[in-house]
């Protein structure tokens, strides 16, 4: 078959499964004169051969774990052995079969965990390797806890990340582990290849011994601090302690206050730095954080609660300079006139803000003093004697003492005696007819004027008219404002009208007074009026079920994956067509009919997450009205960014000659997301030839120390290649270079000769 099994000399790639006994040729290359024979070079491992006539074949089973790719070259030679064509690259990709079992790096692991550690934060990693291809299920490992000893009430206290092998506490473990009850646990962990999904997978087990240690990183009890303290500040109010010495403590103001009156020292003692004012702020909640020497948090922050205790430092205040009440002249003994509500800024429901009311003066004292009484705690004024006569005294002024346990304040009340409310409001019309409005009539529009009259004393609560819609408007779309001078009522639209839910509304208005009617008089039909409102349809835009739609997917989802969907309805019931707007990265497409959103390109969290686009719903037919909603696609991270140096390390130097081995610290980072445990880089010297002179040791997940192994270095620049592995799934690795100069040192560090430059003395 020309093309598949034979053909001219050109670059080619062939895939062969490992472990298969050689059974057939790989390819037959055809020679063109003057070529008469072929030559095979490269990674043949004495397995791959080529016959004189161009027959490429292999002589024994391949092993991917020995070599996963054989890079060969084939050249066509003339009769003198000179190359006349090529050499061209021929790549043999050895495809993996599951011929290796996973193996734990240790048969026993030991670790410790503090009680109350954050659930899900690994405190120990088990690690297994499988020589098979990690890009296939054959080399994809899955970890599992097989046994937990002891097991209390059948509750698992430990969990394992089946991909990373990170062992952490469960929620129950975080809450219930107690070294006083059970100081140690044993886990049996299994690892399976084939992603743990196949009956044919290979497995291995290991044992993990875990010691539970006491956690002293605990939130202290809430603190109570008296306001306006006169003691010298700062005052220690509480403390936190990290489990090991050397932590760096800081406080984080949860509420971003303009003034944050707390501090913490490096022992973990927390202080209030200035007097507090409960009336400004009655409680503070902030966090205490413990970090390592590189500024990385050691654990979750602790919440510190400070409650400010009240002292009586505020007098009562009157509601206004003069409080005005009305009383009808025929009101009976004991009737309530109104309540004086003074205020005290001290803590509510305490003695500091409990107010006492007392009338200290009444003017005029006609026909006698003591016409009014006030309820001591409620401040309610009542009629204490007989009914009042407007023609005798139309107005009374009261001076009322309002006191808390330490302060007294005088408030002033004016009581106007008004005519009795024996007349009801009477509508000019009992029927205001009907009105037709479009459903999109503006909110706030006045649609009708209504009028009732009341024969009681003008400009008093007896004659003032309040209008209410008492029937036909359960949604509260209408309201009525009253002109206080004319008692005219203006019917306004308070909420949008809606043809679809209320095409016809039979409205009933009621007119009433703020003052009660006298005994024996009641509102009758004259105080009611009706009105019919017809609402006409307006074609309205579709309505989305949500203003913002949100979805979450992994950044490595396959192209064509459904990542979310949106829904909208048209009030008139028309069909809807969906489209996207603002898909600047060209990542998405939307099904016009269903609103389902699919990926059409590779997604990248590091380019920005969430990715925000607008979705547009448009009526099909009609006037093609549309509305817009937001679609936010949250991309979860996969490990697709190799490690790199966190910054440019330009001026790394040692003073020459070295008196003792030296070291320097550098930091790595990558652009992937590191929830919970942060980055977990491992570091190694990349070149064997450098390992005699240099060593690299890990400090924490992001920092490492590069050290010299001896002192015998020349006065020159050395380039040290360091391999950084991010330990992700799959692990990504990169090689970075640090340039380290060994130089003579002056007072200001490295002294480098300037060299000859125009105009610059050396």
């Amino acid at each position: 078959q020309e093309g598949k099994f034979s053909g001219p000399l050109k670059p080619m790639t062939f895939s062969i499964y490992e472990g298969q006994e050689p059974s057939q040729i790989i390819f037959q290359f055809k020679a063109n004169p003057p070529a008469v024979t072929f030559e095979l070079t490269g990674e043949t491992d004495n397995i791959f051969k080529i016959e004189r006539e161009g027959l490429l074949y292999y002589t024994k089973a391949l092993d991917r774990e020995t070599r996963s790719t054989h890079n060969l070259q084939v050249a066509a030679l003339d009769a003198n052995g000179a190359i006349v064509e090529g050499p061209v690259p021929i790549t043999i990709e050895v495809k993996d079969v599951n011929d290796n079992r996973p193996t734990f790096l240790q048969s026993k692991y030991e670790g410790s965990v503090r009680q109350n550690s954050r659930p899900g934060k690994p405190f120990l990693y088990v690690n297994a390797t499988d020589l098979d291809d990690p890009a296939t299920p054959n080399g994809q490992l899955s970890y599992q806890i097989v046994i937990q000893l002891p097991m209390i009430n059948n509750v698992m206290y430990f969990q394992i990340n089946n991909k990373t092998g990170g062992i952490s506490l469960t929620r129950e473990g975080s809450q219930e582990l107690n070294p006083a009850k059970n100081p140690s646990y044993n886990l049996v962990i299994s690892v399976k290849d084939m992603g743990g999904q196949s009956e044919n997978s290979f497995s291995d087990t290991t044992s993990v011994d875990i010691i539970v240690t006491e956690n002293i990183w605990k939130a202290p009890e809430p603190v109570e601090m008296v306001e306006n303290s006169t003691d010298p500040h700062p005052i220690k109010i509480t403390q936190v302690r990290w489990n090991d010495p050397g932590a760096q403590y800081s406080l984080v103001d949860k509420e971003k206050l303009p003034r944050f009156p707390f501090s913490i020292d490096q022992e973990g003692d927390i202080y209030v730095t200035q007097p507090l004012d409960r009336e400004e702020k009655d409680a503070y909640v902030f966090y205490a954080v413990a970090k390592d020497e590189y500024g990385k948090p050691l654990s979750y922050p602790l919440e510190i609660h400070v409650k400010v205790q009240d002292i009586n430092d505020n007098p009562p205040t009157c509601p206004s300079p003069v409080t005005v009440f009305e009383v009808q002249e025929n009101e009976r003994l004991g009737n309530s006139i109104g309540a004086l509500t003074a205020h005290d800024s001290d803590e509510e429901n305490t003695a500091n803000s409990l107010l006492n009311y007392r009338i200290v003066e009444q003017t005029p004292k006609l026909p006698m003093d003591g016409l009014f009484l006030i309820q001591t705690y409620a401040g309610m004024l009542q009629l204490a004697k007989q009914s009042l006569k407007k023609q005798d005294t139309p107005q009374y002024n009261l001076t009322i003492e309002v006191s808390d346990k330490d302060f007294k304040t005088l408030c002033f009340v004016q009581i106007n005696v008004i005519d009795i409310n024996d007349q009801i409001p009477i509508f000019e019309k009992s029927d205001y007819g009907n009105l037709t409005l479009a459903e999109d009539t503006n909110v706030g529009s006045t649609i009708l004027t209504i009028q009732a009259t009341d024969a009681d004393e003008p400009f008093t609560g007896s004659s003032k008219i309040l209008y209410h819609v008492i029937k036909g408007d359960s949604e509260g779309r209408l309201g009525v404002d009253t002109d206080p001078h004319t008692n005219t009522g203006y019917v306004i639209i308070k909420k949008p009208l809606d043809f679809e839910t209320a095409a016809i509304s039979n409205i009933v208005f009621k007119a009433e007074n703020p003052e009660p009617l006298v005994f024996g008089v009641t509102y009758n039909a004259s105080s009611f009026a009706k009105f019919t409102l017809f609402v006409t349809d307006v074609n309205e835009a579709p309505e989305f079920s949500q203003y913002v739609f949100q979805a979450k997917v992994s950044e490595d989802v396959a192209i064509g994956t459904k990542v979310g969907n949106v829904t909208a309805k048209d009030p008139e019931g028309l069909d809807i067509s969906y489209s996207l707007r603002g898909d600047t990265r060209g990542w998405l497409k939307i099904d016009h009919v269903t609103g389902e959103i699919f990926s059409v390109a590779p997604l990248d969290r590091e380019a920005g997450s969430p990715y925000r686009v607008q979705v547009v719903a448009t009526e099909v037919g009609g006037s093609s009205l549309s509305s817009v909603s937001q679609f936010h696609l949250i991309l979860t991270d996969v490990n697709d960014n190799p490690p790199r140096l966190a910054k440019d390390y330009m001026d790394l130097y040692f003073c020459h000659p070295l008196s003792a081995p030296g070291s320097l610290i550098f930091e790595a980072t990558d652009d992937d997301q590191h929830l919970f445990r942060g980055p977990h880089f491992t570091f190694s010297i990349a070149s064997e030839s450098l390992q005699n002179d240099w060593q690299v040791s890990k400090i924490n997940g992001t920092h490492a120390r590069l050290s010299t192994r001896h002192t015998d270095f020349e006065e020159k620049e050395y380039v040290v290649s360091i391999r950084i592995n991010d330990g992700g799934r799959p692990p990504l690795e990169s090689t970075v270079s640090l340039t380290v100069t060994f130089c003579s040192c002056g007072e200001d560090g490295c002294f480098r000769p300037a060299g000859h430059q125009p105009g610059i003395p050396t």
Epitope: P33, P34, V36, E39, T41, G42, Q73, A75, D78, A79, N80, G81, A82, I83, P87
Partner: antibody, heavy 119, light 112 residues
Framework: QVQLVQSGAEVKKPGASVKVSCKAS????????IHWMRQRPGQGLEWIGY????????KYNEKFKDRATLTADTSTSTAYMELRSLRSDDTAVYYC????????????WGQGTTVTVSS | DIVMTQSPLSLPVTPGEPASISCRSS???????????LYWFLQKPGQSPQVLIY???NLASGVPDRFSGSGSGTDFTLKISRVEAEDVGVYYC?????????FGQGTKLEIK
């Protein structure tokens, strides 16, 4: 045993042509290439070109491409080198040699043919 | 064309003493298959050339083992461990990596 026997000495006038033969024996003539070299008096060796008797393919040194023709007669296992438009500086000993296929070296040389170009 | 340069051009040697001839090429003769396409031969007085060393270091059949070849991609050496009277003649190096094949100028070995 393997041997190459060349034709005898030639004396030619300038502008004439000469055709030197090289008869092979002791091996399969079509398996190996035959190369032609010359050595001028007191000088080093120069490569003229080669012929592959199996298919008659030839390759020449650019310097001789327009004047030299290499041929082979497989029926008599004989290779020929013809040089045209002779000049006095073509006076030399002309050698044929077998280039050993697969080992890639000159393993057998002819005894040489002296060509003298003189007016 | 690849230029081949030999040194010395004349080499007087006492019988039983070692001798060494150098050859340099203007381009590396090492090919990706690991072979170096350099050839040494000897032309004794009045005779046709005869092979000594092929592919830089391989001793041809019938050649005494006092002859050896070595070198890198561009610098090559032919060594005779103990010169004998029959070794006199002109020694040539030749490259056959590329056409045209080219020769060194030759080194004349004579007995002191």
């Amino acid at each position: 045993q393997v041997q190459l026997v060349q034709s005898g000495a030639e004396v030619k006038k300038p502008g004439a042509s000469v055709k030197v033969s090289c008869k092979a024996s002791g091996y399969t003539f079509t398996d190996h290439t035959i190369h032609w070299m010359r050595q001028r008096p007191g000088q080093g060796l120069e490569w003229i070109g080669y012929i592959y008797p199996r298919d008659g393919y030839t390759k020449y040194n650019e310097k001789f491409k327009d004047r030299a023709t290499l041929t082979a007669d497989t029926s008599t296992s004989t290779a020929y080198m013809e040089l045209r438009s002779l000049r006095s500086d073509d006076t030399a000993v002309y050698y044929c040699a077998r280039f050993y296929y697969g080992y890639w070296y000159f393993d057998v040389w002819g005894q040489g043919t002296t060509v003298t170009v003189s007016s | 064309d690849i230029v081949m340069t030999q040194s010395p051009l004349s080499l007087p040697v006492t019988p039983g003493e070692p001798a060494s001839i150098s050859c340099r090429s203007s381009k590396s003769l090492l090919r990706s298959n690991g072979n170096t396409y350099l050839y040494w031969f000897l032309q004794k007085p009045g005779q046709s050339p005869q092979v000594l060393i092929y592919r830089m270091s391989n001793l041809a059949s019938g050649v005494p083992d006092r002859f050896s070849g070595s070198g890198s991609g561009t610098d090559f050496t032919l060594k005779i461990s103990r010169v004998e009277a029959e070794d006199v003649g002109v020694y040539y190096c030749m490259q056959h990596l590329e056409y045209p094949f080219t020769f060194g100028q030759g080194t004349k070995l004579e007995i002191k």
